[in-house]
Interface confidence: medium
């Protein structure tokens, strides 16, 4: 099929990086710059994407292949393919549409962008918290209390120095 | 419309810090951010650090153990801190304003002269 | 540190004449590049960001192009009120750096 395919059709000879020009007898035509094809046999290039304003080139375009966008910096992205940049949040915090928001109680965020998420419940695990969570991290736990038999080596953890849940200001 | 205001102490001792409260009107800080940018007189000017919308800060390298920026988004007020001051901080400090659609400097300040002299 | 390299440093022309500032980035930052327009005594005006958009309110004369490490300014009449100093600034990456300036003096 694929050879039938091929004596019909001399555009399927046309390798990524070219296109099928109709107007020169359907000769392989490399693309125009600032243009791709990413699969053979194509009759028209895409043009690349341009990296402007908010976004910054992660990769620039090549005849077979598109631009990759990322965000400049204070920025991050949004979406498949980095198709929208917001502003960076500080960890512990999310973005609302009020601007960026501490994460409640109970819940955190270890990075400059996405949602506050809850804290691990440790109990569920049948364990104990170690360690205390905070806006920015999460609670570690620990083994559960049936496990730290009489005498077992087991590490004491401090008395918590603040309300637990909140990261020193 | 859109402001900036710069407010400092003109002249600075040599060792001390010092501290420059920027004022906005015209635009909310939960939304932009606001960078310093400095520039001794009659030379070019030199990028500072930025506070974004959600309060993360950013410094240059040359001056991150000095610099501290911060903000009262219920005052409307980014505050930028210089510690260990030579003769070499004196410059025009402006601030300015961070569009939504590029790491720039779409409003100025207009800038506050400061000195630092014994 | 990514050093922005502007020339000429200055330049005398007269109201009327094309102008053209080049600005070279030490490493190749997209089109991630900023002008701006300072007059003495007062604060820096954008005028270009993306290397080719003009801000808003931004006279048409004022076009600029470029990308990778090469970048370049266009007055394309100069006019009275355009007699200050440019200045390139790149933002693909930390820290923010400017150019050393390029001022335009009346012939």
């Known amino acids: 099929f694929e050879r039938t395919r091929s004596l019909q059709d001399p555009c399927s000879n046309c390798p990524a990086g070219t296109f099928c020009d109709n107007n020169r007898n359907q000769i392989c035509s490399p693309c125009p710059p600032n243009s791709f094809s990413s699969a053979g046999g194509q009759r028209t290039c895409d043009i690349c994407r341009q990296c402007k304003g908010v976004f910054r080139t992660r990769k620039e375009c090549s005849s077979t292949s598109n631009a990759e966008c990322d965000c400049t910096p204070g920025f991050h992205c949004l979406g498949a393919g980095c198709s929208m940049c917001e502003q960076d949040c500080k960890q512990g915090q999310e973005l609302t549409k009020k601007g960026c928001k501490d994460c409640c109680f109970g819940t955190f965020n270890d990075q400059k962008r996405g949602i506050c998420r809850p804290w691990t419940n440790c109990s569920l695990d049948g364990k104990s918290v170690l360690v205390n969570g905070t806006k920015e991290r999460d609670v570690v736990c620990g083994p559960s209390p049936a496990d730290l038999s009489p005498g077992a080596s087991s590490v004491t953890p401090p008395a918590p120095a603040r309300e637990p849940g909140h990261s020193p200001q | 419309q859109v402001q900036l205001q710069e407010s400092g102490p003109g002249l600075v001792k040599p060792s001390e810090t010092l501290s420059i409260t920027c004022t906005v009107s015209g635009f909310s800080l939960i939304s932009y951010g606001v960078h310093w940018v400095r520039q001794p007189p009659g030379k070019g000017l030199e990028w500072l650090g930025v506070i974004w919308s959600g309060g993360s800060t950013d410094y240059n390298p040359s001056l991150k153990s000095r610099v501290t920026i911060s903000k009262d988004t219920s005052k409307n007020q980014v505050s930028f801190k210089l510690s260990s001051l030579t003769a070499a901080d004196t410059a025009i400090y402006y601030c300015?304003?961070?569009?939504?659609?590029?790491?720039?400097?779409?409003?100025w300040g207009q800038g506050t002269l400061v000195t630092v002299s014994s | 540190d990514i050093q922005m390299t502007q020339s000429p440093s200055s330049l005398s022309a007269s109201v009327g004449d094309r102008v053209t500032i080049t600005c070279r980035a030490s490493q190749n930052v997209g089109t991630n590049v900023a002008w701006y327009q300072q007059k003495p005594g007062k604060a820096p005006k954008a005028l270009i960001y993306?290397?080719?958009y003009r801000d808003s309110g931004v006279p048409s004369r004022f076009s600029g192009s470029g990308s990778g490490t090469d970048f370049t300014l266009t007055i394309s009449s100069l006019q009275p009120e355009d007699f200050a100093t440019y200045y390139c600034?790149?933002?693909?990456?930390?820290?923010?750096?400017f150019g050393g300036g390029t001022k335009v003096e009346i012939k």
């Open positions: 600034q790149q933002y693909n990456s930390y820290p923010l750096t």
């Open positions: 300015a304003r961070n569009p939504l659609t590029a790491t720039v400097m779409d409003y």
């Open positions: 993306s290397a080719s």
